[in-house]
Interface confidence: low
């Protein structure tokens, strides 16, 4: 009797542990039986086609690899599909910034955040501030909050995140606390 | 070369019907494998159904289509149909034909839209 493949899905052949940026990486699509034997392999991504053999391979992946992969194959009787098999990658903190609320220049006496944005899998677990003489503050969470900002808070700072990958730095960016009416008037 | 239009996608209400058909043209004769896959937006592209070219025509089906969708072919003019009924709004999607020849190579359509509204 002839009948579509059986039983299609995706197996990672390699690494055997868990997927870092720049691994070599390979995907198998593997099926239990079809009749007839002569098959086809397809590959999609998030509904993009990538390849037509039984393995995908990547020879150093990247973050923008991660997504859900599925393959299908097919015979002269018909098409079988696997389940969406999901890669993830994990990979150090990357594009750090530096974003400042509510904006890059604050009057005296109000408040100003600063926050650690960036790009990381597993998520940053781990935030260290540093003002623009490469001097650590006591501050390890995402947002860095100064209430009331005072003229001598103006410079540039830069942070660092850190998970169980690595870590990674932003560049500098600057605040400029100017002051308010009154201390001018009172000068 | 195997060249692939779809046709019949729409607007239609939920519990509607609809009947798309892939029309086949170039070396048809190598056919052996047609079926219909659909992408909804942001979703993985699917396999909706499919058939063999072969006498028995053998068919295979999704779980979300058994009993709603039914997936035919006209050998002598070429075309695949895929008959939907009873359509809910999840069907909404763009639907693909996929033409699979005897040496093993694919074509796609560039796929029809089907939009059920609630």
């Known amino acids: 009797v002839q009948y579509a493949p059986r039983d299609v899905r995706v197996r990672k052949i390699k690494p055997l542990s868990e997927i870092h940026s720049g691994n070599s990486v390979s995907l198998q699509c593997d099926f239990s039986s079809s009749h007839p034997k002569e098959v086809q392999f397809f590959w999609e991504k998030n509904g993009r086609l990538l390849g037509k053999e039984s393995q995908l391979n990547f020879d150093s992946i990247s973050p923008e690899d991660a997504g859900s992969y599925s393959c299908w194959v097919n015979n002269s009787i018909g098409q079988t599909a696997s389940k969406a098999w999901t890669l993830e990658v994990l990979y150090a903190p990357r594009r750090l910034r530096v974003s400042m609320s509510p904006g890059d220049q604050v009057m005296e006496g109000k408040s100003a955040t600063l926050t650690c944005e960036s790009d990381a899998n597993p998520p940053v677990s781990h935030y260290t501030w540093f003002d623009w003489n490469n001097q650590s503050l006591p501050y390890h969470s995402q947002k860095l909050r100064l209430e009331p900002v005072k003229v001598q808070h103006s410079g540039a700072y830069w942070c660092q995140g850190t998970n169980s990958v690595g870590k990674g730095r932003s560049p500098l960016s600057t605040l400029t606390v100017y002051y308010s009416p009154e201390t001018i008037g009172r000068r | 070369q195997v060249q692939l239009v779809e046709s019949g996608g729409g607007l239609v209400q939920a519990g509607g019907s609809l009947r798309l058909s892939c029309s086949a043209s170039g070396i048809t004769s190598s056919i052996n494998s047609m079926g219909w896959h659909r992408q909804a937006p942001g979703k993985q592209r699917e396999l909706v159904a499919s058939i063999g070219r072969g006498g028995s025509g053998s068919t295979k089906y999704a779980d979300s289509g058994k009993g709603r969708f039914l997936i035919s072919r006209d050998n002598n003019k070429n075309i695949l149909f895929l008959e939907m009924n009873s359509l809910k709004p999840e069907d909404t999607a763009d639907y693909y034909c996929?033409?699979?020849?005897?040496?093993?190579?694919?074509?796609w359509g560039r796929g029809t839209q089907v939009t059920v509204s609630s």
């Open positions: 996929l033409e699979v020849t005897t040496d093993l190579s694919s074509y």
